[in-house]
Interface confidence: medium
């Protein structure tokens, strides 16, 4: 991998905590102003594999609100607006990092956590499993 | 909002840094063992709006590797396996949290950053935007 020289202006870290515990500035640098996925695009409605967005709230997590996609149908929408079960609507999932308050209810102490979220749905050709 | 009583066992925080700077334990609690999206599913190939996954690496960011989806076509794949430009392949995007080393090259000091990533693609009916 690339070896990057350590910046001499880095905060000190005690060996017993390092590198497991780090300092994190929560002043988020955010290039994206629109955080509500329902406003950012209407793909969830216009897709041939449409989905609903469900609000998942957890005050012990940062961010506390995450939107979860749930495919509306098993199949995909055809020209007539009907569900075609020859194709499958499937969720596109992504692992994301969140901060979990640890110990619980602490405002300034967290642990990194990876969670799997469904972001939207896509229409796929099904895999046929023939049973002998 | 819900008021949760503060845990008396929380680490101390100095007023000048609080609540902007917090302690984060990087020992990730991970319920998901498979982090390579190419292995986790083959939806990117089987979708009617297929996509390629591009590796985005940045040693100053945690996680340093993020996979970005790029739709293969403007249109969607039809029943004959051809690209149909009457429909549009569009990226499904999500805002995610990452940790950015700050100051740069510091192993134990970070700032939270929100970035927009494309997770996969979905097939949508197009909207007509006729320009006057």
């Amino acid at each position: 991998g690339i070896t990057i020289p350590r910046n001499p202006g880095c905060p000190n870290s005690e060996d017993k905590n390092f590198p497991r515990t780090v300092m994190v500035n929560l002043n988020i640098h955010n290039r994206n102003t629109n955080t509500n996925p329902k406003r950012s695009s209407d793909y969830y409605n216009r897709s041939t594999s449409p989905w609903n967005l469900h609000r998942n709230e957890d005050p012990e997590r940062y961010p506390s609100v995450i939107w979860e996609a749930k495919c509306r149908h098993l199949g995909c929408i055809n020209a007539d607006g009907n569900v075609d079960y020859h194709m499958n609507s499937v969720p596109i999932q992504q692992e994301i990092l969140v901060l979990r308050r640890e110990p619980p209810h602490c405002p300034n102490s967290f642990r990194l956590e990876k969670i799997l979220v469904s972001v939207g749905c896509t229409c796929v050709t099904p895999i046929v499993h023939h049973v002998a | 909002g819900i008021t949760i009583p503060r845990n008396p066992g929380c680490p101390n925080s100095e007023d000048k840094n609080f609540p902007r700077t917090v302690m984060v334990n990087l020992n990730i609690h991970n319920r998901n063992t498979n982090t390579n999206p190419k292995r986790s599913s083959d939806y990117y190939n089987r979708s009617t709006s297929p996509w390629n996954l591009h590796r985005n690496e940045d040693p100053e960011r945690y996680p340093s590797v993020i996979w970005e989806a790029k739709c293969r076509h403007l249109g969607c794949i039809n029943a004959d396996g051809n690209v149909d430009y009457h429909m549009n392949s569009v990226p499904i995007q999500q805002e995610i949290l990452v940790l950015r080393r700050e100051p740069p090259h510091c192993p134990n000091s970070f700032r939270l950053e929100k970035i927009l990533v494309s997770v996969g693609c979905t097939c949508v009916t197009p909207i007509v935007h006729h320009v006057a």
Partner: antibody, heavy 120, light 112 residues
């Protein structure tokens, strides 16, 4: 203001090649596709080819073997090449823009046309 | 290829009259996504064609409301409620549901 400006030769000998350039302004070739359509004198319109915003192409299969389309996004130019010209290729050749969000809908804006006469 | 048949090929009218042009396709123009890609263009003498109507009945920007498109499946029509001098020229119907895109032979609207 959307504009498509065409340039190309007036007279070409049989069996020779044709090259026409369509220079666009008021929109980006990375957002919109460009079609080519021709019209023989006193006759109807015939669709030739389209180049999409991502650079992919769709041809009229009847002419595909003789046609080639390409573009230079940075110069806002689309190029049409046609080989092995015959007298029945004599026509007005038009480039036309289609809406970027609605592929295959309609040709909204047209160039002024390039007159091609194939004659010895 | 889809054949587009226009009737009539020539349409003499008096200014202020209503004009009606028919266009029939050899196959349905309903795409598998539910849209019908039938458009109308007007080509005035010595000019390039201009888009009038897209997707059967939608007027393109700047097109007067005296132009009305209708139809479905394989049968379509363009009606001009009160013909004005600037409406004279050749009207083409066109389909972009199937490749290759095809045009009708044109209907010449002229003064009686």
């Amino acid at each position: 203001q959307v504009q498509l400006q065409q340039s190309g030769p007036d007279l070409v000998a049989p069996s020779q090649s044709l090259s026409i350039t369509c220079t666009v302004s008021g929109f980006s070739l990375t957002s919109n596709g460009v079609h080519w359509v021709r019209q023989p004198p006193g006759k109807g319109l015939e669709w030739l080819v389209v180049i999409w915003s991502d650079g992919s192409t769709t041809y009229n299969s009847a002419l595909k073997s003789r046609l080639s389309i390409s573009k230079d996004n940075s110069k806002s130019q689309v190029f049409l090449k046609m080989n092995s010209l015959q007298t029945d290729d004599t026509a007005m050749y038009y480039c036309a823009r289609h809406d970027g969000y609605s592929y295959y809908y309609a040709m909204e804006y047209w160039g002024q046309g390039t007159t091609l006469t194939v004659s010895s | 290829d889809i054949v587009m048949t226009q009737v009539p090929l020539s349409l003499p009218v008096s200014l202020g009259d209503q004009a009606s042009i028919s266009c029939r396709s050899s196959q349905s123009l309903v795409h598998s996504n539910g849209n019908t890609y039938l458009h109308w263009y007007l080509q005035k003498p010595g000019q390039s064609p201009k888009l009038l109507i897209y997707k059967v009945s939608n007027r393109f920007s700047g097109v007067p409301d005296r132009f009305r498109g209708s139809g479905s499946g394989t049968d379509f029509a363009l009606k001009i409620s009160r013909v004005e001098a600037e409406d004279l020229g050749v009207y083409f119907c066109s389909q972009s549901t199937h490749v290759p895109l095809t045009f009708g032979a044109g209907t010449k609207l002229e003064i009686k």
